[in-house]
């Protein structure tokens, strides 16, 4: 019997605390053979899809979602999901993006190190039905 699809992971580069106006890239990772990665914002009704999927390792594929100039409205919870035909995966844990005013001081670091764990990672609510994601029927709004 085919195993269930592994949950994707999500991380942010260069980190999860980003100065206003700086860039951030969300990285979604899953198994090889992924057709589409989706980055969901806060709720399932707001998401971006990409089929620009690259192989990160022999067993892993990834997609990158970049925000060139972060605004306050970009702060919030993000998570990934993917479609590996003919099934959708479960969602990843949430990753919280924080946007801060740029202090510009030489002693204040611009960002925290990129990580897919730590205090900014929150468990998903797991209310998602792995085989029929609840975003079905909702309009795709662009994240950025």
């Amino acid at each position: 019997q085919e195993e269930d699809l592994p949950r994707p992971s999500i991380s942010a580069e260069p980190g999860t605390v980003i100065p206003l106006g700086s860039h951030v890239t969300f990285v979604c990772r899953g198994p090889v053979g992924v057709q589409t990665f989706r980055l969901e914002r806060d709720s399932r009704s707001t998401y971006n899809d990409t089929e620009d999927v690259s192989q990160a390792s022999p067993s892993e594929s990834e997609a990158r979602f970049r925000i060139d100039s972060v605004r306050e409205g970009n702060a919030g919870l993000y998570r990934c999901i993917y479609y590996k035909p003919p099934k959708w995966s479960e969602q990843s844990d949430y990753l919280e993006l924080l946007v801060k005013e740029s202090s510009g001081g030489p002693d204040s670091p611009d960002t925290e190190p990129g990580s897919s764990a730590g205090p900014t990672q929150r468990p998903s609510d797991n209310s998602h039905n792995e085989h029929a994601p609840a975003s079905q029927g909702l309009k795709a709004e662009h994240l950025y």
Epitope: Q35, R38, P86, W88, A132, P133
Partner: antibody
């Protein structure tokens, strides 16, 4: 509205090949997959394979790996299925169906009208 | 490959009857099961997705239930336009497979 327009009936000799087409309209061709399904007279439905026009990825039933080849032309929003080395067993109606997954589920939600293929000497 | 077994093969009913069609999978497929209707000389039409989710434009008398290996399509008060073949299909894994179908006919 979503439409899948399939090519006309084919009469072919044993051992030859045919290429069936399925022209999609009413949606973004590259945002969905395209499945092909076989139905012999009075029989059930048999999945042949599926292609994703956005990147050309395709998946086949083991039964037809040496029989069918799926392709897609993004510029004309048309999918194709070539059947080769035809035998009487390939005489059937062939349907194309949109494999819709964009909004987070998967199902063959729209179907073409079918193309009848008759293999006879 | 996942085998889907539909029963009964034929169901003879009178308009107004309520009926249940069964589809059993050879292994657990969660809720990755869809139902299609096919009338004579027509293309299949999607009725129910993911075992129980309704489809826009499909009459509310059609409903689905089940999970794992056992699934049911119910038609509440059959109408004459409902006669034809009904197929279940799984999308849990490649290759996609269909059941052999249940023929709903007039008694």
């Amino acid at each position: 509205q979503v439409q899948l327009q399939q090519s006309g009936a084919e009469l072919a000799r044993p051992g030859t090949s045919v290429k069936l087409s399925c022209k999609a309209s009413g949606y973004t061709f590259t945002s969905c997959g395209l499945s092909w399904v076989k139905q012999r007279t009075g029989q059930g439905l048999e999945w042949i394979g599926e292609i994703y026009p956005s990147n050309g990825n395709s998946y086949y039933s083991d039964k037809v790996k040496d029989k069918a080849t799926l392709t897609a032309d993004k510029s004309s929003s048309t999918a194709y299925m070539e059947l080769r080395s035809l035998t009487s067993e390939d005489s059937a109606v062939y349907f194309c169906a949109r494999a819709y997954y964009t909004n987070g589920y998967y199902a063959m939600d729209y179907w073409g009208q079918g193309t009848s293929v008759t293999v006879s000497s | 490959d996942i085998v889907l077994t539909q029963s009964p093969a034929t169901l003879s009913v009178t308009p107004g009857d309520s009926v249940s069609l069964s589809c059993r999978a050879s292994q657990s497929i969660s809720n990755n099961l869809h139902w299609y209707q096919q009338k004579s000389h027509e293309s299949p039409r999607l009725l129910i997705k993911y075992a129980s989710q309704s489809i826009s434009g499909i009459p509310s008398r059609f409903s689905g239930s089940g999970s794992g290996t056992d699934f049911t399509l119910s038609i509440n008060s059959v109408e004459t336009e409902d006669f034809g073949m009904y197929f279940c299909q799984q999308s849990n894994s490649w290759p996609l497979t269909f059941g052999a179908g249940t023929k709903l006919e007039l008694k």
